[in-house]
Interface confidence: low
Amino acid sequence: LVPHLGDREKRDSVCPQGKYIHPQNNSICCTKCHKGTYLYNDCPGPGQDTDCRECESGSFTASENHLRHCLSCSKCRKEMGQVEISSCTVDRDTVCGCRKNQYRHYWSENLFQCFNCSLCLNGTVHLSCQEKQNTVCTCHAGFFLRENECVSCSNCKKSLECTKLCLPQIENVKGTEDSGTT
């Protein structure tokens, strides 16, 4: 099966790489604009230069193109805890990230929030914190894992999943209570 091409891709495929077909005259192939620039005017004729202009501050193009406008620079979302790793330039968008000892949680493909890496108190680090994944903790005896924190088995209620992990401790507590009532 041949993938469906949009009109623009069809038109571009007629011209050699690095060129695009003139929108008003399909016998002319114009040279695409370099990254960091945008198309101001199409080339007037074969072998003549395309009029490309540099992107203004606050905008960019990251690859060769024939866009009529540069793309607006992304802004790091402070409300998501993001920090700017590198500023926007005419040929590269802003790069956003998280602070040290934080990881990214992606809400959607393009939106992430920064969270603090778990420290594994009362446990050990099974897998270190990664750029896009929290630390994976293993808890010490007498503690169970709840929402990636090691919680004392004294907080384990019988109805919870922790009963399997905390069974000896729970039985001991029960035994103590029983002996106190006799």
Epitope: E79, G81, S108, N134
Partner: nanobody, 124 residues
């Protein structure tokens, strides 16, 4: 037992304002991320806004950005949604929702508890 009780809904004219409240109980409120979700008549659920446990981080759906403000008072265990410049398309039942995890939500719909909802009708 976890309980979320919304209030503040009602009938308002286009361009008007309303403030929704959600009283929370049965869990350690300041620790959990919270959200507002809505359901317009005959439509599916639409996520509106979220706020982190510390109240510092917020996020809004594009449809309400600049008009709605989410906030919380952790000392009162209450979540708020200030709705300004209301439009007919904001007509919906608004639900307060608690995220299942306090570490990081798995998605925008990773809720374990919902309120019963409060109806907001925007009409002239």
């Amino acid at each position: 037992e976890v309980q979320l009780l919304e209030s503040g809904g009602g009938l308002v004219q286009p361009g008007g304002s309303l403030r929704l409240s959600c009283a929370a109980s049965g869990f350690t409120f300041p620790v959990y991320n919270m959200a507002w979700v809505r359901q317009a008549p005959g439509k599916g659920l639409e996520w509106v806004s979220f706020i982190a446990g510390n109240g510092q981080q917020t996020y809004y759906a594009d449809s309400v950005k600049g008009r709605f403000t989410i906030s919380r008072d952790n000392s009162k265990n209450t979540l708020y949604l200030q709705m300004n410049s209301l439009r007919a398309e904001d007509t919906a039942v608004y639900y307060c929702a608690k995220f299942a995890s306090k570490v990081s939500p798995m998605s925008l719909t990773d809720f374990d508890y919902w309120g019963q909802g409060t109806l907001v009708t925007v009409s002239s």
